[in-house]
């Protein structure tokens, strides 16, 4: 049967059971997501907005496949094997009562079946496997896998240790507690911080420390992934995204008509293809552009780079290059740099660094 | 390369009864439910009955139920519509389609027979 | 039961324009709709699956969105081949169908 062919694997939860709180639904599908990521390479990171590989849905009767569901009792619950489209989506029966403990039907155990067949599994026939064809309540603090299910789900995708440092060849969600995390591109947009990753961005609003993940493409639906550098004019409400050798314009969160435009109307030369990080520093009122190991300073008023330029970033920003990935400025006097994994507060008044951290030590990693 | 040929069509009086094969090749016909799709003459498409890969499980369109039955043989590759009760408004061009799924059927058909025509008249 | 809405019913159009054609489920069914374009005398091919996704082989000028209720199918610029009938589909229900005429 059909298998995910990749080790990072999104999930949405599409509408809430009025049957339970919002945050023990989450917890129950966040939990069954994790017992099968324990025993497997498996990774799984919810998204609120967008395609997910694998949608969770309440419902009752027919709701948009061939097989509606048939009010309290009998079916639970269904759920479709690994695939695009519907592929791996979770539907729950809301004729049933959704619990967090015995009574009704438990969410957390029906929902660990599911995901089961969302990951390719089949029914088991060991009365004892969570894939066995009946539901039976379980004291779910000491639920575990049976020896049938592992073997199961690692015939399909092997066990944990296996992989465990997987590039992300298939553009899916990394993720973002990974030690070895880096970003494309950084950027302020007013009090929330953007980090874009292949088709994905962070949003991370200043001094909170809760982080959303969510799809480019749901948020500007014309925009392309593999974003490669981003820089925000705050006065302005402007924020410019940048891919290979174009750029987009977005005003008040919307993208501008008559984008993309050529990076060569900042002034570039020929040689220049694409820009690895960008950043505007509003007290200067000049935004850096930095391109392999040199940058480049623009002036926003004039509209003009400035003459001597470019210059060697190792030359200029002390500790920082030769080159970089990312960049933005925060709290009016520190550029953060980001090197692969690393990430390096850079005082641009006292021209030095004052910390180096990881890339994703802003999400409470 | 999936193919689909759809054969057993033909004039059939009202009341009278025919069956339709589907011969499948180009993929492994036991994985996928199979579906029949019907177009009544200058019509719009109507879905008329699925089956899951195993044969297991059987749908039917309220038009049709009671009447129709689907049918396959994994070992010959083929899918059947077994058609009782003939009615004029069941006049149209049959079509097998493949579903892209197996367990649960996505509805999704990424392949189509070139049809056979049905025609129920007296 | 879910029903589905197809509009418009006939559509003329030249060549090189942008053609918009919509569909809607009186209930939610998520992403769970699909596009078919038919010929005449011909069986229905599957161009859009998922309502956003091209089956491969489809030309790029073919763009599907929506969600929940509400679906819509572009063709940007419209081509010779492309004058037929468009249907939207999900599981058993089709809409009834949309005719793309020369003008």
């Known amino acids: 049967g059909p298998v995910w062919r990749k080790h990072y694997i999104t999930y949405r939860i599409n509408n809430y059971t009025p049957d339970m709180n919002r945050e023990d639904v989450d917890y129950a599908i966040r939990k069954a997501f994790q017992v099968w990521s324990n025993v497997t390479p498996l990774k799984f990171s919810k998204i609120n907005t967008g395609m997910a590989d694998i949608l969770v849905v309440f419902a009752r009767g027919a709701h948009g496949d061939f097989h509606a569901f048939d009010g309290k009792g009998g079916i639970l619950a269904h759920a479709f094997g690994p695939g695009s489209g519907i592929g791996g989506d979770a539907h729950f029966d809301e004729d049933e009562f959704w619990t967090t403990h015995s009574g009704g039907t438990n969410l957390f155990l029906t929902a660990v079946h599911e995901i089961g067949h969302s990951l390719g599994l089949g029914h088991s026939s060991d009365p004892k496997a969570v894939m066995f064809p009946t539901y039976k309540y379980v004291d779910i603090n000491t639920f575990r896998l049976s020896a049938d299910d592992i073997r199961g789900i690692q015939s399909l995708y092997g066990d944990p240790k296996e992989n465990q440092r997987l590039p992300n060849p298939d553009n899916s969600e990394p993720a973002l507690c990974d030690p070895n995390l880096s970003f494309d591109a950084v950027t302020t947009v007013g009090n929330k911080i953007f980090f874009f990753k292949d088709r994905f961005f962070w949003l991370k609003v200043s001094e909170r420390p809760k982080t959303s993940v969510n799809l480019i493409s749901s948020l500007w639906p014309t925009l392309p992934s593999g974003i490669e550098a981003a820089y925000e004019i705050e006065a302005r409400n402007q924020v410019f995204l940048f891919k290979d050798d174009k750029y987009w314009l977005i005003s008040n969160l919307r993208p501008e008509p008559n984008y993309p435009k050529s990076i060569h109307s900042f002034g570039f030369p020929n040689f220049v293809k694409k820009i690895d990080a960008a950043v505007f520093n509003p007290r200067f009122y000049r935004t850096y552009f930095f391109v392999d190991n040199q940058y480049w300073r623009y002036d926003e008023r004039r509209q003009m780079m400035d003459p001597g330029y470019p210059k060697l970033i190792t030359k200029n920003f002390q500790g920082i290059g030769p080159k970089i990935d990312a960049v933005f400025y925060s709290k009016n006097k520190y550029y953060y740099f980001f090197q692969g994994s690393n990430q390096f507060e850079y005082d641009f008044l006292l021209q030095r660094i004052t910390k180096t951290l990881k890339s994703n030590s802003w999400f409470g990693c | 390369e999936v193919q689909l040929l759809e054969s057993g069509g033909g004039l059939v009086q009202p009341g009278g009864s025919l069956r339709l094969s589907c011969a499948a090749s180009g993929f492994t016909f036991s994985w996928y439910w199979m579906h029949w799709v019907r177009q009544a003459p200058g019509k719009g498409l109507e879905w008329v009955s699925g089956?899951?890969?195993?044969?297991?499980?059987?749908i039917y369109a309220d038009s049709v139920k009671g009447r129709f039955t689907i049918s396959r043989d994994n070992s010959k590759n083929t899918l059947y519509l077994q058609m009782n009760s003939l009615r004029a408004e069941d006049t149209a061009v049959y079509y097998c389609?493949?579903?892209?799924?197996?367990?649960?059927?996505?509805?999704?058909?990424?392949?189509w027979g070139r049809g056979t025509l049905v025609t129920v008249s007296s | 039961d879910i029903q589905m809405t197809q509009s418009p019913s006939s559509l003329s159009a030249s060549v090189g324009d942008r053609v918009t054609i919509t569909c809607r489920a009186n209930?939610?069914?998520?992403?769970?709709l699909n596009w078919y374009q038919q010929k005449p005398g011909k069986a229905p091919e599957l161009l859009i699956y998922?309502?956003?996704s091209l089956q491969s082989g489809v030309p790029s000028r073919f763009s599907g969105s929506g969600s929940g209720t509400d679906f819509t199918l572009t063709i940007s610029s419209l081509q010779p081949e492309d004058f037929a009938t468009y249907y939207c589909?999900?599981?058993?229900?089709f809409g009834q169908g949309t005719k793309l005429e020369i003008k």
């Open positions: 089956i899951v890969s195993s044969g297991g499980t059987t």
């Open positions: 998922a309502a956003s």
């Open positions: 209930q939610s069914i998520y992403t769970y």
């Open positions: 589909q999900q599981a058993g229900i």
């Open positions: 389609a493949k579903d892209i799924r197996g367990a649960y059927s996505s509805g999704l058909f990424d392949y």
